[in-house]
């Protein structure tokens, strides 16, 4: 058995003093004879004790005994007892009863031998065992009077050795965390929830964190179970930044050659079909019409110019139908229509002239006469001494229905080097120079150009009642979009209900919303739910074909012939398609290139598309000139080319 240093010292001391104990007993006998039976002097007492300290201790007390109990000769038993006790320093016991093992009598002194856990001269001081090596406890040491006790922190229990602490596995109790996952920890446990949830100790359940309360999003925030999504004002030209919380500008990733020619006149600026230029010619001198200009278009139909007077009198309209020149004319109320010449909507410049001769109108293409029409009368009409002629470019000054044969007057075409009536008047040139919207792109290709700030709308029907299936209404939405995008974000096509719900949208997006991952994708969605996604190399300057097919029980998205990945379960898809069918049976408008002012959360993308695009819906090519509405900056049949970096 190993003893602590203090205990060993206390154990050894009594052994050293055993010889002294024998001497003490002899001394008691001398004291009896010398000082109890008769009075002894101090010298006699010294002879008994044979040392000064004990004599000095004894003699004053001896005198006190005599004062209290009388001299020896009086034979008072209390006197004898009083004197006999004086040499024994342990009587009465000066040591603390509770902490003392034994009191040892010394020469004029005493020594208290303490029990374990006590210390001090009188063994009345508690020893703090916890000071030294934590009392041997592995965690908590509690000092107690004369003792100590090991204890453990919450989550631990004391081993049988009374010193070691062992971890308690709280997770063995299934009720510890309730619905949450329980993870045992040293001395503790943790109730874990999936990301986006927080543990409620009160309900013992995982509760959704409303991240929107934490102002994480720069603009619009939508909370969802376990997550949230931020939305940016796409119509305002913003998209989500890579951090998925803040917004950034939608910037072009493909540069289009947007240079315009100041010496050109763009005919397609007014979607209303109203003329881009109105000229009023008045002469005192009789004058004949001579109109000459260079012209370029890919558009198959539209009005180049009108010249004449009121709709019911005398006028001519030079237009295009099916890509060939057509002249409609009315002389003194009698209408005629002539079409001839080559197809000229090939996108190359050609010179066109219309000349009024004495009894003929001659139309030339590149100086070759393609039409010669006999006419009876003059285009300039004499009124109150002055010859009048109104000339409008890119439209007519009256309703299309008043033409000999109605035509869609909208013409995405370009004129340059014009000469009206040998006119040297710089008015048109000055007006065009001051207004870039009246100018044409210097170079164009086939397609329709969406500048990223507007859309076109159509009233299309996607449902039909099949007679062979009774009155069962079937529906189908098949879209083929050939795109050459300039930006990575934007709506290609969408269907919008009267209540601003977006039953279908097909759009370019640069992130995966659920995975919160930046990626160039095409998304097919019903309302705000993505049905399918497909990767696209949107910024490679190449043309890509996006095909979408939606019908009863089916929703597919393809990019360049590769099928996209479904984002919903079969059940979810069916539920979404049922929702779509309901919308299609109501009133829907088809939007191309963007969305109206709907909520940013009504569809995955609300930004305007920027780039080239031609669309086919349910097998029919969409002609932007036949739209219900088109933003005037969208060019219906022409597109600027991609700007290739010069080496």
């Amino acid at each position: 058995v190993l003893l602590r240093a203090r205990e060993a010292a206390q154990f050894l001391r009594p052994r050293q003093r055993r010889a002294y104990q024998v001497f003490e007993e002899a001394k008691q006998g001398h004291l009896e004879r010398e000082c109890v039976e008769e009075v002894c002097s101090k010298e006699e007492a010294r002879e008994v004790f044979e040392n000064d300290p004990e004599t000095e201790y004894f003699y004053p007390r001896y005198q006190e005994c005599m004062r209290k109990y009388g001299r020896p000769e009086e034979k008072n038993p209390d006197f004898a007892k009083c004197v006999q006790n004086l040499p024994d320093q342990c009587t009465p016991n000066p040591c603390d009863k509770k902490g003392t093992h034994i009191c040892q009598d010394l020469m004029g002194n005493f020594f208290c031998v303490c029990t374990d856990g006590w210390g001090g001269r009188l063994c009345d001081k508690d020893v703090n065992e916890c000071v030294q090596k934590n009392g041997g406890c592995s965690q908590v040491c509690h000092n107690k009077p004369g003792s100590f006790q090991c204890a453990c922190h919450s989550g631990f229990s004391l081993a049988s050795d009374g010193q070691t602490c062992q971890d308690i596995d709280e997770c063995t109790d299934s009720d510890t965390c309730g619905d949450a996952r329980c993870k045992n920890l040293p001395g503790s446990y943790s109730c874990l929830c999936d990301e986006g949830y927080t543990y409620s100790s009160k309900e013992k359940t995982c509760q959704d964190v409303d991240e929107c309360q934490q102002d994480r999003c720069e603009q619009t925030c939508v909370n969802s179970p376990g997550s949230y999504t931020c939305h940016c004002d796409g119509r305002g030209g913003l998209k989500l930044s890579p951090d998925m919380d803040t917004c950034e500008d939608i910037l072009p990733c493909v540069p289009f050659s947007m240079a315009k020619s100041v010496k050109s006149l763009y005919l397609g600026r007014m979607f209303s079909g109203t003329p881009v230029i109105r000229l009023r010619f008045k002469r005192l001198q009789p004058t004949r019409l001579l109109a000459e200009f260079d012209f370029r278009t890919f558009d198959p139909e539209g009005v180049l110019f009108f010249a004449g007077g009121r709709s019911d009198s005398t006028w001519i309209v030079l237009g295009l139908r099916a890509g060939r020149l057509e002249l409609q004319l009315r002389y003194n109320g009698v209408g005629r229509i002539t079409s001839s010449g080559p197809t000229i909507n090939h996108g190359m410049w050609q010179t066109i002239s219309v000349e009024e001769l004495e009894r003929n109108l001659v139309i030339k293409v590149n100086k070759d006469a393609v039409m010669k029409i006999a006419v009876a009368g003059e285009l300039f009409q004499l009124e109150r001494g002055l010859y009048h002629l109104n000339l409008t470019v890119g439209g007519i000054p009256f309703k299309e229905s008043e033409l000999v044969q109605p035509i869609n007057p909208r013409l995405d075409g370009c004129m340059r080097s014009w000469n009206w009536l040998n006119g040297e008047d710089s008015a048109i040139q000055e007006t065009v120079k001051a207004n870039t919207k009246m100018q044409c792109f210097s170079v164009t290709e086939r397609g329709s150009f969406f500048p990223g700030n507007g859309f076109a709308t159509y009233r299309l029907n996607y449902t039909r009642t099949s007679l062979d299936v009774g009155t069962e209404t079937t529906w189908e939405v098949k879209v083929v979009a050939r795109i050459r995008p300039a930006t990575d974000t934007g709506v290609l096509l969408a269907l919008v209900g009267d209540d601003d719900v977006v039953p279908i949208s097909v759009a370019l997006v640069d992130y995966h919303s659920t995975k919160k991952l930046k990626k160039q994708l095409v998304v097919l969605a019903v309302e705000d739910v993505a049905l399918a996604l497909m990767e696209i190399k949107v910024c490679d300057s190449q043309e890509h074909t996006v095909t979408v097919s939606l019908r009863e029980g089916e929703a597919t998205l393809e990019v360049d012939g590769t099928k996209g990945q479904s984002e919903v379960s079969t059940a979810q898809l069916q539920e979404r398609l049922d929702t779509l069918k309901t919308h299609l049976q109501g009133s829907v408008h088809t939007y191309v290139g963007g969305l109206p002012e709907v909520s940013v959360i009504s569809a995955p993308v609300t930004a305007f598309y920027r780039g080239c695009m031609t669309l086919e819906v349910n097998g029919k090519i969409l002609d932007l000139d036949t739209a219900s509405y088109k933003h005037s900056d969208i060019t219906s049949h022409s597109c600027p080319p991609v700007e290739h970096a010069t080496p």
């Epitope: 109150r384 002055l386 040998n422 040297e424």
Partner: antibody, heavy 116, light 107 residues
Framework: QIQLVQSGPELKKPGETVKISCRAS????????MNWVKQAPGKGLKWMGW????????TYTEEFKGRFAFSLETSATTAYLQINDLKNEDTATYFC?????????WGQGTLITVSA | ETTVTQSPASLSVATGEKVTIRCITS??????MNWYQQKPGEPPKLLIS???TLRPGVPSRFSSSGYGTDFVFTIENTLSEDVADYYC?????????FGAGTKLELK
């Protein structure tokens, strides 16, 4: 560019004749008629009439019928205004102006002073 | 003959002020009214042609309105360079007739 350049000022006595020229350049002369406008000192503008540059046929307003004559020299792309039997009230600046129903291009004007 | 009555004959304004000149015709001339500016020793300059059309190069402080028989010519924020005589001209019918003119001076 289109220009109409008129002959210089003239000082004439009453009863004399004056012929003012207006030379046109920068356009096809015969495509546009030529107008003449009178402005007496400190007074307003008065349209005198015009001449058809194709046929040479003149048209005069009532006030300027009789002593006034418009003529042409097509080969020289020039129009003329002749005033016979000058009177004091003929003292004025005479402008030629190209016919466009209204007047965009004007000559610089020729001052004719009639004084005994 | 359509007569044109122009008013006022003269007016004096401070720079920055608005100027309004009126022409009334004796017959309905639709919008066949033109407005000219003439500075001393120079031929008249066409500012606005038929249909209230501002001519190329003419500052936008000049404008006109009117249809039928009542026409107004306006200069917003008059500048010292606008000191001149101003004439209206009807081109609806022959003979063409001018207004008597308005002399614009600066105070």
């Amino acid at each position: 560019q289109i220009q109409l350049v008129q002959s210089g000022p003239e000082l004439k006595k009453p009863g004399e004749t004056v012929k003012i020229s207006c030379r046109a350049s920068g356009y096809t002369f015969t495509n546009y008629g030529m107008n003449w406008v009178k402005q007496a000192p400190g007074k307003g503008l008065k349209w005198m009439g015009w001449i058809n540059t194709n046929t040479g046929e003149p048209t005069y307003t009532e006030e300027f019928k009789g002593r006034f004559a418009f003529s042409l020299e097509t080969s020289a792309t020039t129009a003329y205004l002749q005033i016979n039997d000058l009177k004091n009230e003929d003292t004025a600046t005479y402008f030629c102006a190209r016919d466009e129903g209204w007047f965009v291009y004007w000559g610089q004007g020729t001052l004719i002073t009639v004084s005994a | 003959e359509t007569t044109v009555t122009q008013s006022p004959a003269s007016l004096s304004v401070a720079t920055g002020e608005k100027v309004t000149i009126r022409c009334i015709t004796s017959t309905d001339i639709d919008d066949d009214m033109n407005w000219y500016q003439q500075k001393p020793g120079e031929p008249p300059k066409l500012l606005i042609s038929e249909g209230n059309t501002l001519r190329p190069g003419v500052p936008s402080r000049f404008s006109s309105s009117g249809y039928g028989t009542d026409f107004v010519f306006t200069i917003e924020n008059t500048l010292s360079e606008d000191v001149a005589d101003y004439y209206c001209l009807q081109t609806d019918s022959v003979p063409l007739t001018f207004g008597a003119g308005t002399k614009l001076e600066l105070k």
